[in-house]
């Protein structure tokens, strides 16, 4: 068998670090057998069999000019093998960050913090951190480690499915190359990394007969679980065209009636979502939707949701008090089940 341990990576390649002493090993001989070393395609003897180094070639302070293919020959001139030298660096700890778009799963991405120049792979795992006792942290068998399954096609991402919202996790991402391994440990709490996707289906409609009103509606992001135990709250911003500043409101449900729109001007509207109890951070803003308040008079048929507003708005009426906001039924999803085992009925 070969005296040369096979490093992780392509066969026939051996590895070293620039500026360091590098030993090349002749693969086709017995350990200690004296060999001669040549650069491939060059007749000059690099190291003879009388060097006392047996089957190894020593390159002091290797640099890029030493990279390439080497040939070793036994005393009788037989080919002992060919070796390709590739120089690079041991792994540095990768940079890791994790994010969650819902409260049941999270993903972690990583980047090398230094390019090694060598074949590299990543080992990804996680364990659930369980604290037992006042100030001792002990592991129970159920806490892992478990593999964090990596995305196919080499994307630097792994996903933990079925995570527990209240638990802490320790992510392990280890960068491995032929010169070693280096590990980054990252402690993750789903509560702190939760950032929902932005709300979807944002629509902005005029309210017939009300030249200062716009009705915006939207839906939960598709990535949020269909029957959520944890709910979302929303933030809505709007502004007239060409106006630099946004006005912000926090709607009670999945729609909002804007009562101070500028008559006749198109308005941009966008919404953002966050966990109902303020875990994590606000989502990015949804794509803007546009709407223009109606200019006509109030219709004879008043929409059911607008029955409170029986007086048409007359512009300009600077001093007139704004009519009461429409009373929106709470959406069933806006009931917080986080601390409740029972289902709460919404009475219409």
């Amino acid at each position: 068998s070969s005296p040369c341990p096979q490093a992780w990576g392509p066969p026939g390649v051996q590895y070293g670090q620039p500026g360091r002493s590098v030993k090349l090993c002749c693969p086709g001989v017995t350990a200690g057998d004296p060999v001669s070393w040549f650069r491939d395609g060059e007749p000059k003897l690099l190291q003879g069999p009388d060097s006392g180094l047996g089957h190894e070639l020593v390159l002091a302070q290797a640099d890029s000019t030493d990279e390439g293919t080497y040939i070793c020959q036994t005393l009788d001139g037989a080919l002992g093998g060919t070796v390709t030298l590739q120089l690079g660096y041991p792994p540095a700890r990768p940079v890791v960050s994790c994010q969650a778009a819902d409260y049941e799963n999270f993903s972690c991405t990583w980047s090398p913090s230094q390019i090694s120049g060598l074949p590299t792979r990543y080992l990804t795992s996680y364990r659930k951190k369980t604290v037992l006792g006042a100030d001792s942290q002990r592991r129970s068998p159920s806490t892992g480690p478990w593999p964090c399954p990596q995305d196919p096609l080499g994307a630097a991402r792994c996903v933990v499915h079925g995570a527990e919202f209240w638990s802490q996790y320790r992510i392990n991402v280890t960068e491995v190359n032929p010169l070693g391994a280096s590990t980054r440990l990252l402690d993750v709490s789903l509560q702190s990394i939760l950032r929902p996707d932005p709300p979807q289906g944002l629509r902005v409609e005029s309210v017939p007969g009300y030249p200062r009103r716009l009705r915006a509606s939207w839906t939960y992001p598709a990535s949020w679980p269909c029957q959520p135990h944890f709910l979302l709250k929303f933030r809505l911003q709007y502004r007239p065209a060409q106006h630099p500043a946004w006005s912000t409101v926090e709607p009670a449900g999945l729609e909002e009636v804007i009562t101070d729109a500028v008559a006749g001007l198109p308005h941009a509207v966008r919404v953002s979502a966050r966990d109902f109890l303020d875990a994590g951070t606000w989502s990015t803003w949804s794509p803007e939707a546009w709407g223009t308040p109606s200019t006509g008079t109030i219709p004879k048929e008043i929409p059911a949701w607008g029955q409170l507003h029986t007086q048409p708005e007359v512009e300009p009426q600077v001093d007139s008090p704004a009519p009461p906001r429409p009373s929106l039924q709470p959406h069933p999803r806006l009931l917080d089940h986080r601390d409740s085992v029972e289902q709460v009925a919404v009475l219409a």
Epitope: Y89, V95, I115, A156
Partner: antibody, heavy 118, light 107 residues
Framework: EVQLLESGGGLVQPGGSLRLSCAAS????????MTWVRQAPGKGLEWVSS????????QYADSVKGRFTISRDNSKNTLYLQMNSLRAEDTAVYYC???????????WGRGTLVTVSS | DIQMTQSPSSLSASVGDRVTITCQAS??????VEWYQQKPGKAPKLLIY???NLQTGVPSRFSGSGSGTDFTFTISSLQPEDIATYYC?????????FGPGTKVDIK
Amino acid sequence: EVQLLESGGGLVQPGGSLRLSCAASGFTFSWYSMTWVRQAPGKGLEWVSSIVPSGGHTQYADSVKGRFTISRDNSKNTLYLQMNSLRAEDTAVYYCAKGPGWGSFDLWGRGTLVTVSS
Amino acid sequence: DIQMTQSPSSLSASVGDRVTITCQASQDVSGYVEWYQQKPGKAPKLLIYDASNLQTGVPSRFSGSGSGTDFTFTISSLQPEDIATYYCQQYDNLSPTFGPGTKVDIK
């Protein structure tokens, strides 16, 4: 010669913006994480921001988050720091520094002075 | 953020003296600590990495030790050119932090 050279510092009013650059030479810039560290006059060192070789991960000190943006152009061997909404407390010498790895700084530039004052 | 405390804040010693600076982290940082030397008007220079490894080209009179939360930096025989401020720094997590520095001068 292995070196880092910062530029772009100067006097700016509070609320203003400035863009710092750091030109790298003598090493394979695209292989290393890069960092900005600052030092207020007569004070200690404060880490500001770092970026991985690919640019895919960045990190900021809480004191600059949302106001500063770190970026790099590997084709130009240059690191940048875009500084917006500047405050008097951002007055400092800004150094750019090279990895190895993340958070380890084995090569520093000479620094560029940023003064925020009205 | 991890806080790094350094002591003393300043010291005076004679040429040839052994000088010791300590650094304490507010939480375990494994061995991910570096020591820097900064001379007036100059950029910092890396002396020690990974708590105890001497950076290439740095004189062997400089050394470091420690792990977890407690770290020590030593100049075995102080030289006139060692007048400077010395900083410890942790890089265990993604937000590195520096100690406040120790100013070293000659008696």
